[in-house]
Interface confidence: low
Amino acid sequence: MRWCLLLIWAQGLRQAPLASGMMTGTIETTGNISAEKGGSIILQCHLSSTTAQVTQVNWEQQDQLLAICNADLGWHISPSFKDRVAPGPGLGLTLQSLTVNDTGEYFCIYHTYPDGTYTGRIFLEVLESSVAEHGARFQIPLLGAMAATLVVICTAVIVVVALTRKKKALRIHSVEGDLRRKSAGQEEWSPSAPSPPGSCVQAEAAPAGLCGEQRGEDCAELHDYFNVLSYRSLGNCSFFTETG
């Protein structure tokens, strides 16, 4: 066992926001996502707009703990999910062998110092394979209907094209601009630079020396220590609390 009070304290850590501090950060998530039964999905969150140090990230489904990534201790996957949950990429979580029961809300809870706790929400819908197939079939007539509608619209447009050419051009430009902005916005969101091998905390968020190396030995031991999680967090013999 490589840590003492640091562990129990840093891990038992429940970080509340500082009363005096402004929580400026924001959590960006993959939002609402769907996947096929039997498949896999990556849950991804990203904390931005804050210089706070990420001490730990919890992944929870409703009130069930899935996994923890602790800056000092590395990853811990809850025993009941070990077969189907894989850490990463980065601070994300990969769910495998999805079942319909996996449908629901997932939360990434970032414990930071000194800001406190940030929570992101992702809604996952797991679809039956057959439902997904039916959905694809229904899309064909739907596309046909859309095409017919477009033909009608185009005809109408052609009738008035001479009168509205200038306005139409402006309108198309505006729409293209909006689309471009949305696209750019989506590109802006991406997980931070990959962490060093074995690392769980973003390179820019972790203080020097934290999580920069594989902590396999510690993590293996942790399986003996991590029991039932009651709320949304951990501390260190200082491990029973936090690491400053």
Epitope: L6, I8, G12, R14, A16, F240
Partner: antibody, heavy 121, light 112 residues
């Protein structure tokens, strides 16, 4: 008033079991890590075990690993130490202690008065 | 495991005089976060221990400023600027960096 009260100590034969309890009052028990520390009369202090506020992290001294189990019930403001396969060398005064901080380490800032465990045939 | 060694084991002091206790660890207690995970506790006769200093040099709440902690890495010192009769007891250092946490053997301070 912040207070920790240990109970459950007593005389027990070698190889038998005993369960110590520590009841907390005067603070938000579920916010803090807790520890068990023991002291052989007239001797020094020995850290026995510690547990994070949410039971996620648990640690043991090598001398008790595999025999003692620490646990807590936040709803009851209680800390426990299940001691199995007791040995004569486990005879001591057992203190429970509160961790001082829930954001940064602040030492063990509150201690109980202790409960005596005597292992003898 | 980290071994903590205190000296002296016995310290007779005249009231009003300063006192100094040394604690040495077998490994550095300086964490990468910049903190030294070393505490000092005082156990008065017939009482439970109580916290004096945490993280090497931080005085616990209610502890008189006569007490100060210093040091880094493996060598630490607890100083009492002016000893009072109420300061008698056994002083313990504790390393809180690695599990298992470990205490020093204790230094018994007594009044001359």
């Amino acid at each position: 008033e912040v207070q920790l009260v240990e109970s459950g100590g007593g005389l027990v034969q070698p190889g038998r079991s005993l369960r110590l309890s520590c009841t907390a009052s005067g603070f938000s028990f579920d916010d803090y890590a807790m520890h068990w520390v023991r002291q052989v009369p007239g001797k020094g202090l020995e850290w026995v075990s510690g547990i994070s506020w949410n039971s996620i992290t648990i640690g043991y001294a090598d001398s008790v690993k595999g025999r003692f189990t620490i646990s807590r019930d936040n709803a009851k403001n209680s800390l426990y130490l299940q001691m199995n396969s007791l040995r004569a060398e486990d005879t001591a005064l057992y203190f429970c202690a509160k961790d001082g901080g829930n954001r940064k380490y602040y030492g063990m800032d509150v201690w109980g008065q202790g409960t005596t465990v005597t292992v003898s045939s | 495991d980290i071994v903590m060694t205190q000296s002296p084991l016995s310290l007779p002091v005249t009231p009003g005089e300063p006192a100094s206790i040394s604690c040495r660890s077998s490994q550095s207690l300086l964490h990468s976060n910049g903190y030294n995970y070393l505490d000092w506790y005082l156990q008065k006769p017939g009482q439970s221990p109580h916290l004096l200093i945490y993280l090497g040099s931080n005085r616990a709440s209610g502890v008189p400023d006569r007490f100060s902690g210093s040091g880094s890495g493996t060598d630490f010192t607890l100083k009492i600027s002016r000893v009072e009769a109420d300061d008698v007891g056994v002083y313990f250092c504790l390393q809180a960096l690695q599990t298992p946490c470990s205490f020093g053997q204790g230094t018994k301070l007594e009044i001359k």
